[in-house]
């Protein structure tokens, strides 16, 4: 038993030209939240398969409104860790999927709009009980910075949380802060006991009694935001409170690169040069080959069979990234004009236009009903980006010029038979029902449950709907 923990540090526009200024569309304010999904890592699963190891959802972030004069976006993020409990053994190799969702808050035709802003997918090897692993991922025009770890809970110990540790009543031969584990009395395990008061969100420990800080936090208990705010794509007064990554003095202090990797400082961060056979931001991924199935979404893996050889994923159309984990986000180019909502249907792009606009990219400005005539008694309805006719019974089509079958919608309830009529439709009700659409049951004594039949009509008679 244990828990997988994910801490989002920052989400914002990636470096380079063409990055969006705001996560919100032109329609108004929005807020972000994150969804994390864990899947067993070595099985070749479809991208949309269930989150077999568990899933979690952040709280919705505070409302974000784009300020036209703002120099750069500073996105308020939801607070707290995302935690995914697991009951069985920690698998060690897993797929981590992080989705950033946007909820648009303005009043709109069709109700609130939700859209997936970014999705990153990583296949990782991670031992439970280890330190926080940091990662930076780009999805389209967005960049996500996060840390994650797996830790055992209750009495479970080990890299897979499969061994149970019972404290013994006899004096321990282990050092301070360590306890012996049954059944191996000679083996000592370090329970995750950090220095008292060490921040659960911003600190971690590899040895009992210590408190090491994540980037952006300082102090003996990692509770003080670092003062320098060089926030890599996110700037502003609230950067510290939203957990934005702020490099401490000396990013390579303590060598964050695992497995013998060498660390070199980059502007505001660090970069690991990994030895052969190791990959990842901190060289924490070892020996991934094509045998591990690292290519998502039907990508073709090419590489040698020996453990030290790298691999290359050749991605199918519509996907990109080193593991084909990123869907090509054609909506990030904002092709829909005039505040239209972009939908990437996979085979095509579709723009849903705001009222008063039309065209494949919402490029045509319409005066909805001006000069538009609806034939055969239809009325013009404004909205939806183009004029629309609400047609009289028996007519259909864009301008109500086509004869429509009023019985096509099967309007007669309870098995009633529908007949087209010059003025609409007629329902011939089954025994026991009455009403213009056969909607009213008739009681056995001949009295209907609702208004009596109009004069001249007996229950069960065909009734004409006028």
């Amino acid at each position: 038993a244990g828990v997988f923990e994910l801490q989002i540090h920052s989400f914002g526009p990636g470096p380079g030209p063409g990055a969006p200024r705001s996560p919100c569309s032109a329609r108004g304010p929005c807020r972000l939240f994150f969804r994390v999904c864990l899947k067993p890592g070595l099985s070749e699963e479809a991208a949309e398969s269930p989150c077999a190891l568990g899933a979690a959802l952040s709280a919705r972030g505070p409302v974000y409104t784009e300020q036209p004069e703002a120099p750069a976006p500073d996105l308020p993020l939801p607070n707290g860790l995302l935690q995914v409990p697991f009951r069985d053994a920690w698998p060690g190799t897993f797929s981590l999927i992080i989705e950033t969702w946007r909820e648009e808050l303005g009043d709109q035709i069709g109700g609130p709009a939700w859209s997936l802003l970014a999705r990153v997918t990583r296949r990782r090897r991670l031992a439970a009980g280890g330190p926080w692993a940091r990662d930076i991922q780009r999805a389209g025009a967005w960049e996500l910075r996060f840390s994650y770890r797996a830790r055992c809970e209750l009495l479970a110990v080990g890299t897979a949380c499969t061994r149970l540790c019972r404290p013994r009543s006899a004096p321990s031969r282990c050092g301070p802060g360590l306890r012996p584990c049954a059944p191996l009395e000679d083996e000592c395990e370090a329970p995750p006991v950090c220095r008292a008061g060490c921040s659960l969100e911003h600190g971690f420990c590899e040895q009992p009694g210590e408190c090491r800080c994540l980037e952006g936090w300082t102090g003996p208990l990692c509770t003080v935001p670092a003062s320098t705010s060089s926030c890599l794509g996110l700037r502003g007064p609230s950067s510290a409170t939203t957990g934005c990554l702020v490099p401490g003095p000396g990013p390579c202090d303590g060598n964050p690169c695992a497995n013998g990797g060498s660390c070199s400082e980059t502007p505001g961060s660090f970069e690991c040069t990994c030895p052969r056979g190791f990959y990842g931001l901190r060289c924490e991924v070892s020996g991934v080959t094509c045998a591990d199935g690292p290519c998502f979404n039907g990508g073709l893996c090419v590489g040698g069979a020996d453990p030290d050889s790298a691999y290359i994923c050749h991605c199918p159309p519509g996907f990109q990234g080193s593991n084909c984990e990123k869907r090509v986000d054609r909506c990030s180019l904002q092709p829909c004009r005039n505040g239209g909502l972009c939908l990437d249907l996979g085979h095509a792009l579709r723009c849903r236009c705001r009222a008063g606009f039309a065209g494949p990219r919402c490029e045509h400005n319409l005066d909805d009903c001006a000069g538009r005539a609806c034939a055969n008694g239809g009325t013009c309805v404004e909205g939806g980006g183009a004029h629309r006719c609400s047609c009289a019974l028996g007519f259909g089509g864009r301008d109500c010029r086509e004869r429509a079958d009023p019985c096509a919608a099967r309007p007669c309830a309870h098995g009633g038979r529908c007949y087209a009529h010059f003025s609409g439709l007629v329902c011939a009700c089954a025994p026991g029902y009455m009403g213009s659409r056969c909607e009213f049951p008739v009681h056995p004594d001949g009295v209907s449950a609702l208004p009596a039949a109009p004069p001249g009509l007996r229950p069960g008679d065909p009734q004409r709907y006028l």
């Epitope: 899933a55 959802l57 069709g110 609130p112 709009a113 939700w114 859209s115 909502l341 939908l343 849903r352």
Partner: nanobody, 125 residues
Amino acid sequence: QVRLVESGGGSVQAGGSLRLSCAASGSTYSTNFMGWFRQAPGKEREGVATLVTWAERTAYADSVKGRFTISQDRAKNTVYLQMNGLKPEDTAMYYCAAAASTAVRLLDPGDFAYWGQGTQVTVSS
């Protein structure tokens, strides 16, 4: 593919209650959104209530707010619509719908790809 089967419709007096059920089968894990829509005779199909399946977030049409409640039982892959205080204008065919896409207007039937056959609700005054 996702298959949806509605049940629970019927006739009821104004002020009464009904509970509709929508049982989903197939690739249900890919459905991000599930909702209830209705179509009265001679009118367009309209959104009633939608649930974001993995986030427990909901959206309701103004005409049903405070009277209808959408919920789900994940273990049974079933979505419910509890309808209280029914009015004659609630009379319609009620459809369950699901969307697996990543951009949806929660009450717009045009954004939902999978539909059930519908269940009739009749409210008499």
